[in-house]
Interface confidence: medium
């Protein structure tokens, strides 16, 4: 229904505390170098005039478009183009093409230092002095290095940080009862803002039928006893909510998403026997519960998919009459008998049903020409079990740490010229899927494998978009969001590279990594790692292993050393002259 | 028992309008997605509309897309079928059907309701 004060409205449906995070986040999302003192004082004034819509709706303004006000203040901000530069351009368009022109510029890789957690005591002081400047510092630094993070999650997260820090600030060893559940909070949240980037990427590149394709396809496992009707109405419903979150509707995207989840929660019983425990909690959990949720029970009386999608005599009549919803049943049909498979497989297999009935469907004798295309669907079912199988054996083999590299040399191969940060940010995350993965039952690994792959695989083609450098990654990058996977997979070692000079300062190293923490001397590791292979695309493993074992006894002695900076100055060099030996 | 009970049709000349009706009983009709199918004459079965239970969304065989508006009351338990524009091969008689789990075999229908389009 129409509302005289669209702020008004969503003012009224959030609440004050989730509006202002929102707002904040919007803010934060949009314009990602501004302090967080600018970016609150612009919430509050956003914060004011909400209120006085819902005193007045006719009062002047109220009447505006979230995106008109929203723009205005942001175009308003002194010394815009200063920090901002050809965003600045964005103020003098109309919306919509105001909100278009914010959007993108949105900067997936901004410049912007990793973001620190304070020690444990300090963190304790300033959250106990205030809880809420605290945690919106938490929302503005996430949304400003994740420009398209999900955020009625973000607040959900939000959430989360508080609770660990309510509990853990009254023990004795803070440190101890913060990092490992900070750490797990953050892990969830990167893997979020990854999945969630993938979806909006869906959008921007292919538009709402491809989105909802995925949706009704995820759905259809996680609700396999709920009509066909049903899961396209839940589906039309994501597809709307990621488009406002993806376009910049914040308020409407969080209000929809509540919605959504109380829809739910009213009509359990035609959609999933396991709901109610989420349906018991309080919106933001509620809404993240349900997103979370374990599939259903699948019916025990399912007739065989080929029933109507094979053997029927009506299969090509049923596809001219509307092939949107023929496929969309296939690929219901299809995906609530197979929670065992990643959605982009199911896609696949939906596509290749497709291109088959396109086919058969204008020949002589179309049910002697498709009766074949689930045996056709095989190795497309092969491909990506393979893929797990080998790669979690590895996994297992070599820990993460070890996967990570193999993955690293993999990638730096297949794509040298991608810069060296981005190659380890991709294989660390890349590399992580065991971790997450391995351990699974094997029914949950392939769809666990696939679908986290294909998100961390999306960043890496986000972040390459940017400044293209391979025609690889950019074939790969620009064929369909489930194809991309199998891409990359295929890729061999770049014939066509010319090997990097070695320069002996890449391989330099100072007393300071001592001093770093696991995680930062693993990235200067890796970051040695990638240069070699860029040096000598086509060194062995056993070289490789042998160079890298030497570095790492190299720094382990150095760091022992009485004198550090002696040892690295002296050993230094007979590294790289080994090193070099080596690679020969 | 579950019962659908058809009404609307008649005799209507080309680029007329006609409104169907289907009352539901003895099921819970609000939680059930409901659909309308037709059969011309000498022709097979041919599905022309889903509703969902809450009445969004909605789906439409392409060759009605655009002329054709599915709505339903819950208060009333009436299903409702809009048709503009109507063709010479709109002529079939229309029957509105509880919509089953599987898209293309329709549990219960009713007796239907002819329509023809002719000058």
């Known amino acids: 229904e129409a509302h005289k004060s669209e702020i008004a409205h969503r003012f009224k449906d959030l609440g004050e505390q989730h509006f202002k995070g929102l707002v904040l986040i919007a803010f934060s999302q949009y314009l990602q170098k501004c302090p967080y003192e600018e970016h609150i004082k612009l919430v509050q004034e956003v914060t004011d005039f909400a209120k006085t819509c819902v005193a007045d709706e006719n009062a002047e303004n109220c009447d505006k478009s979230i995106h008109t006000l929203f723009g205005d203040k942001l175009c308003a901000i002194p010394k815009l183009r200063d920090n901002y530069g050809e965003l600045a351009d964005c103020c003098a368009k109309q919306e919509p093409e105001r909100n278009e022109c914010f959007l993108q510029h949105k900067d997936d890789n901004p410049n912007l230092p990793p973001f620190q957690r304070p020690e444990a005591e300090a963190m304790c002081t300033s959250f106990q002095e205030n809880p809420t400047s605290f945690l919106g510092h938490y929302l503005h630094e996430v949304a400003r290095r994740h420009p398209y993070f999900y955020a009625p999650e973000l607040l959900y997260y939000a959430e989360k940080y508080n609770e660990v820090l309510t509990q853990c600030c009254t023990e004795s060893d803070k440190a101890a009862c913060l990092t490992p559940k900070l750490d797990a909070v953050k892990e969830k949240a990167l893997v979020a803002a990854v999945r969630q980037r993938m979806k909006c990427s869906s959008m921007q590149r292919f538009g709402e039928r491809a989105f909802k394709a995925w949706a009704v396809a995820r759905m259809s496992q996680r609700f396999p006893n709920a009509e066909f009707a049903e899961i396209t109405k839940l589906a039309t419903d994501v597809t709307k909510i990621n488009k406002e979150c993806c376009h910049g509707d914040l308020l409407e995207c969080a209000d929809d998403r509540a919605e959504l989840a109380k829809y739910m929660c009213e009509n359990q019983a035609t959609i999933s026997s396991k709901l109610q425990a989420c349906c018991d909690k309080p919106v933001l959990q509620k809404s993240q519960c349900l997103a979370e949720i374990e599939h259903d029970n699948i019916p025990a009386d399912l007739p065989s998919i080929a029933a109507d999608f094979v053997e029927d005599k009506e299969v090509c009549k049923n596809y001219a009459e509307a092939k949107d919803v023929f496929l969309g049943t296939f690929l219901y049909e299809y995906s609530r008998r197979h929670p065992d498979y990643s959605v982009s497989l199911l896609l696949r297999l939906a596509k290749k049903y497709e291109a088959t009935l396109e086919k058969c469907c204008a020949e002589g004798d179309p049910p002697a020409c498709y009766g074949t295309v689930l045996a056709e669907f095989q190795p497309l079912v092969e491909e990506p079990k393979n893929l797990v199988k080998t790669n979690c054996e590895l996994y297992e083999k070599l820990g993460e740490y070890g996967f990570q590299n193999a993955v690293l040399v993999r990638y730096t191969q297949k794509a040298p010229q991608v810069s060296t940060p981005t190659l380890v940010e991709a294989a660390r995350n890349l590399g992580r899927v065991g971790t997450k993965c391995c351990t699974l039952p094997e029914a949950q690994r392939l769809p666990c494998v696939e679908d986290y792959l294909s998100a961390i695989l999306n960043r890496l083609c986000v972040l390459h978009e940017k400044t293209p450098v391979s025609e690889k990654v950019t074939k790969c990058c620009s064929g369909s969001l489930v194809e991309r996977r199998p891409c990359f997979s295929a890729l061999t070692v770049d014939e066509t590279y010319v090997p990097k000079e070695f320069k002996a300062e890449t391989f330099t190293f100072h007393s300071d990594i001592c001093t770093l923490p696991d995680k930062e001397k693993q990235i200067k590791k890796q970051t040695a790692l990638a240069e070699l292979v860029k040096h000598k695309p086509k060194a062995t493993e056993d070289q490789l292993k042998t160079v890298m074992g030497d570095f790492a006894q190299f720094v382990d002695k150095c760091c022992k050393a009485a004198d550090k900076d002696n040892c690295f100055a002296t050993e230094g060099p007979n590294l790289v002259a080994r090193s070099k030996e080596a690679l020969a | 028992e579950v019962q659908l009970l058809e009404s609307g049709g008649g005799l209507v000349q080309p680029g007329g309008s006609l409104r169907l009706s289907c009352a539901a009983s003895?099921?819970?009709?609000?939680?059930?997605?409901m659909l309308w199918v037709r059969q011309a004459p000498g022709k097979g079965l041919e599905w022309v509309s889903v509703?969902?239970?809450?009445?969004?969304?909605?789906y439409y065989a392409d060759s009605v897309k655009g002329r054709f508006t599915i709505s339903r009351d819950n208060s009333k338990n009436t299903l409702y079928l809009q048709m503009n524009s109507l063709r010479a091969e709109d002529t079939a008689v229309y029957y509105c059907?509880?919509?089953?789990?599987?898209?293309?075999?329709?549990?219960?229908w009713g007796q239907g309701t002819l329509v023809t389009v002719s000058s």
């Open positions: 059907a509880k919509f089953p789990s599987s898209q293309f075999r329709f549990d219960y």
């Open positions: 509703i969902h239970q809450s009445g969004t969304p909605t």
């Open positions: 003895g099921f819970t009709f609000d939680t059930s997605s």
